[in-house]
Every structure is written in structure tokens, then in C-alpha cells.
Interface confidence: low
Amino acid sequence: ELCDDDPPKITHATFKAVAYKEGTMLNCECKRGFRRIKSGSPYMLCTGNSSHSSWDNQCQCTSSAARNTTKQVTPQPEEQKERKTTEMQSQMQLADQVSLPGHCREPPPWENEATERIYHFVVGQTVYYQCVQGYRALHRGPAESVCKMTHGKTRWTQPQLICTGETEPSQFPGEEEPQASPDGLPESETSR
């Protein structure tokens, strides 16, 4: 059963999964200037049996320019920086993962992948939060969220984490409200 919502947003924090439960889907998103190949799957799916789990389908991106070339579009400086961060996180995630039965590991990056990974989690998935660089955790409690099924509805448990700027240790954090989306916390996580 897929979780209806994204995990909770925590200001100045990102979340990641150590491993992904079978049934999890990862959108095949491409960065600007690229698109999914025509015959390509729109998502990767974590599938498996009792002994082994892996991602079905592979994401493939191709240039969306008129001439079908494999030459990579040079990312803008900001895009380059974001991409590097995502790749570093992916490598870090792979390094500290353990093999869990019924779970897939973080899929390796694919060529011309978008900077943000969009996951569709299933009931029972746990994600772990950490403060972004330059912020420290004030809550020492469980900085994790679990997708649970309650009374026929899915919900994520609320992680107990508040991140505060290291430069102002006496202050609570806060993000100015994005005027376009008054009902949601500021977007800050690298994966959904």
C-alpha cells in the first residue's frame, strides 16, 4: 500500500531512507534539457522475493534537443552544485547501508538524472532526518518518520527534530513563508 502523503517537512532538514521497502517507486526524472527515452519506464520499482530485492526497470534520459545527441548539456553553476550534493548524498547513502530483507538499496545515479529524487513510499517505510549543513539538531529524540496505516488511512509519524543555525545557537530556526504555498512548510528536503 502506497503512502498517501510525502514524509513531513522539517525546516532546515533533509531526510533519507537507509533502504527502501519492496513496492517503493522512484520517478525517472531527468534534468533540464533532457527527457525520459520514449520506450523508458516512468519509474523504477523495488521488487523481490524472500531472499533478494532489486529495482525493476532502469531510468534513462536522452537529450530533448531537436537533434538526438548524447552530448550532455553543461549545467548552470547552481545546477552543478545541486547535482554534486545529490551525488555525494547517494554515495554516502550507499556507503552506510546494510542489506535488509525485503528492501532495496539506494539506486545508483543514472546519466542526466534530475537533481531531486521523487520517491513514492509504502506503508512501513522509515525515513531518517538530519539537519542541513550550517544547522544543528536541538531535538535529540527520534529524528525519523514511519509511514503507518491507521483506520484505513496512511500517515507519517512526526519526527522530533528542530534544526537551529550554528551561527546563532540561542535561536530557534525559521524559514520565511513562501507566499505561493501558505499551507506547507518550506521545501528543503532533497528527496520525497
Partner: antibody, heavy 118, light 111 residues
Framework: QVQLVQSGAEVKKPGESLKISCKGS????????IGWVRQMPGKGLEWMGI????????RYSPSFQGQVTISADKSISTAYLQWSSLKASDTAMYYC???????????WGRGTMVTVSS | QSALTQPASVSASPGQSITISCTGT?????????VSWYQQLSGKPPKLILY???KRPSGISDRFSGSKSGNTASLTISGLQADDEADYYC??????????FGGGTQLTVLG
């Protein structure tokens, strides 16, 4: 059951000291901030300050800084509010409340009525 | 820091809708989405009814809704019932890393 249990009503004389308590149960009490809120008779709510019992990190409202002390004992999941020298104007209901992750106080104690009178 | 400004009282008949405003500054209500609303029945502790401007905790009726524009937040109660009679307080997290409450609004449900 998640709850905050506050100590009982107090009647004190001006100049006396006092320490009231708020015990959290039914949740990981070291993982949430606990705030204190004053409500004087017939008046509105006033935020006094907040403490993180996990490491006793404390923040005060400028209006209450130096007037009260907020502390905690994480081993017994209890937060405290204390006065070294009470005044008649300290007469009020004092609530403790748990800070949820959306910066809102989601669980409240029943309140401790403090009466200061000579 | 000054309390947020709320009307002292509002009244309406059962079934009607009412809106309570909560005006602050660009340093509190206007700065964040961290505006919450509390209901306080006579002789009881406050109870959280809305957070993040418009989100309801579980168990809170969808008759309670919230919104925000600039430095003013609003609480709307539709289909007013007798047991909605209470004091209502808004609260906001502030740029000073503190919280501030509104002065409170007494809601009377006319009989």
C-alpha cells in the same frame, strides 16, 4: 496516553519562593520542548519560556527573563517553573505545554493555580 | 513584545459562521506559517485546534478553518454550535525565537 501532569495549587505570601512542576508521560519526554504559559485571572495567555528537557536548553520571553527560572530533570521527565521571591502580581494560573513539531503547543497540562497574598 | 491583536468578543447564532482575526507584524504572523489557534473552554486548559495557519490536529472538526494574508491570520468557525462557546487565542512563532499569543476573543453563541 500522552499527558502533562502539573503539581497542585499553591497559596503563598509575598517574598516567598516557589517551584511548581510538570511531568510528561506517554511519550519520549526528552525529545520535546516544554513551554510555560501564564494566565492571570480573567486575562489572556502569555508565553513565558521553554525548555528542552534532554539537555536543559532554555529560552525565555523578554518579559519574564530574570523573573522566573525554568529547569528540568530528565531522569524523572519533569519540567519546573520557579520564583525566588513571589509578588502579588504573580497570582495566576500557570500551564505547561508540549511543543509539537509544527511550533504549536499540542498537549497542555491542567494548570497550577498560584495565589500570592499577604 | 506586544500581544497579537484579536477582537475582544464576537457573537453569532447557532448554524452561522464567524471569523476571528489575529493581527501581528512582519516579525511574527507575517514572517512564518507557524500560526496556531487554541480553544479554551471555561475553567479548562487551552486546546490546539489549528496549526501551520490552517492544519487541524486529528479529532478537530472540519468546521474550524484558518487562513493568513500578510500580517493577519484568521480563524473561521462554520455551522456554529453551542459547545463552540469559548475563548479563542491565536499564537505565532516570532523572529525573536519566542512565541506570542493574541489577547483572546470571547465567542458567544446566542441562544
Amino acid at each position: 496516553q500522552v499527558q502533562l501532569v502539573q503539581s497542585g495549587a499553591e497559596v503563598k505570601k509575598p517574598g516567598e519562593s516557589l517551584k511548581i512542576s510538570c511531568k510528561g508521560s506517554g511519550y519520549s519526554s526528552t525529545s520535546y520542548w516544554i513551554g510555560w504559559v501564564r494566565q492571570m485571572p480573567g486575562k489572556g495567555l502569555e508565553w513565558m519560556g521553554i525548555i528542552y528537557p534532554g539537555d536543559s536548553d532554555t529560552r525565555y520571553s523578554p518579559s519574564f527573563q530574570g523573573q522566573v527560572t525554568i529547569s528540568a530533570d530528565k531522569s524523572i521527565s519533569t519540567a519546573y517553573l520557579q520564583w525566588s521571591s513571589l509578588k502579588a502580581s504573580d497570582t495566576a494560573m500557570y500551564y505547561c505545554a508540549r511543543l509539537g513539531s509544527a511550533y504549536a503547543f499540542d498537549i497542555w497540562g491542567r494548570g497550577t493555580m498560584v495565589t500570592v497574598s499577604s | 513584545q506586544s500581544a497579537l491583536t484579536q477582537p475582544a468578543s464576537v457573537s453569532a447564532s447557532p448554524g452561522q459562521s464567524i471569523t476571528i482575526s489575529c493581527t501581528g507584524t512582519s516579525s511574527d504572523v507575517g514572517a512564518y506559517i507557524y500560526v496556531s489557534w487554541y480553544q479554551q473552554l471555561s475553567g479548562k486548559p487551552p486546546k490546539l485546534i489549528l496549526y501551520d495557519v490552517s492544519k487541524r490536529p486529528s479529532g478537530i472538526s472540519d468546521r474550524f478553518s484558518g487562513s493568513k494574508s500578510g500580517n493577519t491570520a484568521s480563524l473561521t468557525i462554520s455551522g456554529l454550535q453551542a459547545d463552540d462557546e469559548a475563548d479563542y487565542y491565536c499564537s505565532s512563532y516570532t523572529r525573536s525565537s519566542t512565541w506570542v499569543f493574541g489577547g483572546g476573543t470571547q465567542l458567544t453563541v446566542l441562544g
